[in-house]
Amino acid sequence: EEELQVIQPDKSVLVAAGETATLRCTATSLIPVGPIQWFRGAGPGRELIYNQKEGHFPRVTTVSDLTKRNNMDFSIRIGNITPADAGTYYCVKFRKGSPDDVEFKSGAGTELSVRAKPSAPVVSGPAARATPQHTVSFTCESHGFSPRDITLKWFKNGNELSDFQTNVDPVGESVSYSIHSTAKVVLTREDVHSQVICEVAHVTLQGDPLRGTANLSETIRVPPTLEVTQQPVRAENQVNVTCQVRKFYPQRLQLTWLENGNVSRTETASTVTENKDGTYNWMSWLLVNVSAHRDDVKLTCQVEHDGQPAVSKSHDLKVSAHPKEQGSNTAAENTGSNERNIY
């Protein structure tokens, strides 16, 4: 009679993570008597996957009833496959022995490859806000995919970015892989409504890439521009001075009026108006009683935006000897070009 052969007809099996893998194995003879065992890997470091004699195998089932006397089908199914299950599986026939069974013949092996989807890309931006014209870095991470081949692209408002670096780890063989990419983005004043998108394409996604997004509103700080103007005289001895705070983001802003360097009033921006580009405008006014001043008055609008050092704009009110004769053009002179930092 011909000697027993162990036949594993499939050289390789490809399974998606979460599915069930069927590893086929048949023997050509019932002799010699002894159990079948399945191993992953070969040599002394192999892992026992299934033992016909004993053991508990929550994820492994046999295709046929191994207790039947003339059974020669030793195929198994492994459920809920993960990338960690990848490897070469060997069906091994043992000959009954004492005290131990002796390995008799092995199949040629079946390589199990696992396709696993990448996790949803997570995009993160810089820890601190940055102003327009600055370059900021965004990172994108995705994990747990297999095989290793993967494509990652960056977009800003639908336009593909080119300044980025991508690494796939580990470099060598692994059960699953991770991708990490860093993109550099130059901010503009119009970026409050902008989005940065990281797009990952993988064989498991069937042409439907995964995307992670970051809103530049979380990253950008647009500093305000200030304009101090004097309004026409409201009453005989009163001058209305306004401070226009324009095109700032985010909204967090505190304004202080100074009269000759002394704090007159402090207020926080509340009822702001929003521009189309997502930035904000705000106006504050100060009513100055000219008759209370014997000398010229230096009015300063000082703005602290988003915790940054204060910026200011000043306006000189000329107090004339004859306030009743003042017109809107002669009552004060606007010298609001004096913009400076106050620390």
Partner: nanobody
């Protein structure tokens, strides 16, 4: 070289539960098959449960089947033994063991490394 450190032992009433943990260091944990053994006073060390390196196959001594569950967390280098419905005869020092090769319940002969043990006392 592999270092093994057991924890989670203690005293419990009959019918109670305990979970033993064993942390391994010094070698890639996912290349080691792991097992638990116990030694009662005046008796030989006996096999309790074993688990293959990926956790796909598990083995239990007949008297522990259905009461004890072995599991592992390869990310944390940990192997666990959940012991339910404990009996006074389960009182022993429980040892964690690591093997480079694993042949099911032949694990005692294949264990290359042993922990110091943790005492489990079950009173009636």
């Amino acid at each position: 070289q592999v270092q093994l450190q057991e924890s989670g032992g203690g005293s419990v009433q009959a019918g109670g539960s305990l979970r033993l943990s064993c942390v391994a260091s010094g070698r890639t944990f996912s290349s080691l098959d792991m097992g638990w053994f116990r030694q009662a006073p005046g008796k030989e060390r006996e096999f309790v449960a074993g688990i293959s390196r990926s956790g796909i196959s598990q083995y239990y001594a007949d008297s522990m089947k259905g009461r004890f569950t072995i599991s592992r967390d390869n990310a944390k280098n940990l192997v666990y033994l959940q012991m339910n419905s404990l009996k006074p005869e389960d009182t022993a020092v429980y040892y964690c063991a690591a093997a480079l090769t694993f042949r099911g319940s032949d694990l005692p002969r294949d264990s290359n490394y042993w922990g110091q043990g943790t005492q489990v006392t079950v009173s009636s």
